[in-house]
């Protein structure tokens, strides 16, 4: 991959600090369903234990069937820092629901990320920013806390913080969808 | 209003060299990633190279590898594409385009340049 | 990489017509597709992203559908100003890739 180093606050394509981003619909503009692994090819799988469910990041048999996950894309208000409207294009939000009534949310106090039974609308904590990077993997940033992204740490997910000076390749934070 | 003014186009000889460039404002130029399309006389739209502003990836259409270097200078709100080893299979309109989204490539490109003109012939 | 076949690759028709123009992927997924409409001598325009949204500014006779490999572009009662090629591209996976192009000329 190329480098190209250009290192103002958010040159980086994270969303500006302090910005608040505001849900342009209610409903989401198109879902999928897809299977996650990390950057690594590990599976990220989901157990009902004990009435809640965990979250595992794990190689996977060769027959055993990877857990979809629903992604739900919304559409976001990008503020603006330079252009006189206030507003400067879109971003895509998504939600990501691997059971019926379950969403994956952010923990900003533990650090971690947790599944979450809710009915909508679903709090801030359930949308993350999506990043297109490294040409076919994808990153998920925190709604609720600028530059902290989902990502891979102990074979569990937590929330990782991403200094905006760094590049965002990190593979801890690159995960890959499958359709198929 | 967005606009986006390419320059740099014209007529050189197999071999040569050339640099593209495109102007970009009206929006936040380095939240969003950036790309060259082309589009050879008669033909359809060709994706050459983009640019995205996280970590500064790159791509680039096999045709082109080793030839053309895409990059930016976010102060001066610009993309480039400078173009080597030209072939006459390189003669195309030169289009430079925003992505819709600014983390995301998946709603392809709102707005495009008017295009400049590359020939390669002797 | 997504290989995207458009047909027909050119269509007569009279203004208040009803034009559709579909786009077939080599391998499907699930509705990152755009539809762009371009004149000649100018730039592509954005019509239609994720498949079935409208760009801002774009007129409501023109409609998307579709996913997995099986995509269409839909332009009711025609106008003259709808005259032009209309390419789509798959926005999914890199590379992003184009159809072949699609003329609507005047019968």
């Known amino acids: 991959m190329g480098s190209s180093h250009h290192h103002h606050h958010h040159s980086s394509g994270l969303v500006p600090r302090g910005s608040h981003m505001s849900i342009t619909g209610i409903s989401p503009i198109t879902e999928s369903l897809a299977s996650l692994s990390t950057y690594n090819d590990q599976s990220i799988t989901f157990a009902l234990e004990d009435e809640s469910y965990e979250i595992y990041v794990e190689d996977l048999k060769k027959d055993k069937k990877k857990d979809k996950v629903l992604l739900s894309y919304y559409e976001s208000q990008h503020p603006s820092s330079e252009s006189g409207d206030g507003v400067d294009g879109k971003m895509l939000m998504v939600t990501l629901s691997p059971t019926k009534d379950f969403w994956l949310q952010a923990n900003n106090k533990e650090h971690s990320v947790e599944l979450h039974k809710c009915e909508k609308p679903l709090p801030d904590q359930a949308f993350f920013v999506l990043h297109n990077r490294s040409f076919n993997c994808v990153s998920f940033e925190c709604k609720t806390d600028p530059g902290v992204f989902i990502g891979v740490k102990d074979n569990h997910l937590a929330l990782i913080k991403v200094d905006y000076s760094e590049n965002l390749g990190s593979e801890n934070i690159l995960f890959k969808l499958s359709e198929t | 209003e967005v606009q986006l003014v390419e320059s740099g186009g014209g007529l050189v000889q197999p071999g040569g060299s050339l640099r593209l460039s495109c102007a970009a404002s009206g929006f936040t130029f380095r939240s969003f990633a950036m790309s060259w399309v082309r589009q050879a006389p008669g033909k359809g739209l060709e994706l050459v190279s983009d640019?995205?502003?996280?970590?500064?990836?790159?791509y680039y259409a096999d045709s082109v590898k080793g030839r053309l270097t895409i990059s930016r200078d976010n102060s001066k709100n610009t993309l480039y594409l400078q173009m080597n080893s030209l072939r006459a299979e390189d003669t195309a309109v030169y289009y430079c385009?925003?992505?819709?989204?600014?983390?995301?490539?998946?709603?392809?490109?709102?707005?495009w340049g008017q295009g400049t003109l590359v020939t390669v012939s002797s | 990489d997504i290989q995207m076949t458009q047909s027909p690759s050119s269509v007569s028709a009279s203004v208040g017509d009803r034009v559709t123009i579909t786009c077939r992927a080599s391998?499907?997924?699930?509705?990152?597709l755009a539809w762009y409409q371009q004149k000649p001598g100018k730039a592509p325009k954005l019509l239609i992203y994720a498949a079935s949204s409208l760009q801002s500014g774009v007129p409501s006779r023109f409609s998307g559908s579709g996913s997995g490999t099986d995509f269409t572009l839909t332009i009711t009662n025609l106008q003259p100003e709808d005259f032009a090629t209309y390419y789509c591209q798959q926005a999914n996976s890199f590379p992003l890739t184009f159809g072949g192009g699609t003329k609507v000329e005047i019968k």
């Open positions: 640019l995205r502003t996280s970590g500064g990836s790159t």
């Open positions: 385009a925003k992505s819709h989204y600014s983390t995301s490539w998946f709603g392809g490109f709102d707005y």
């Open positions: 391998q499907g997924f699930s509705s990152w």
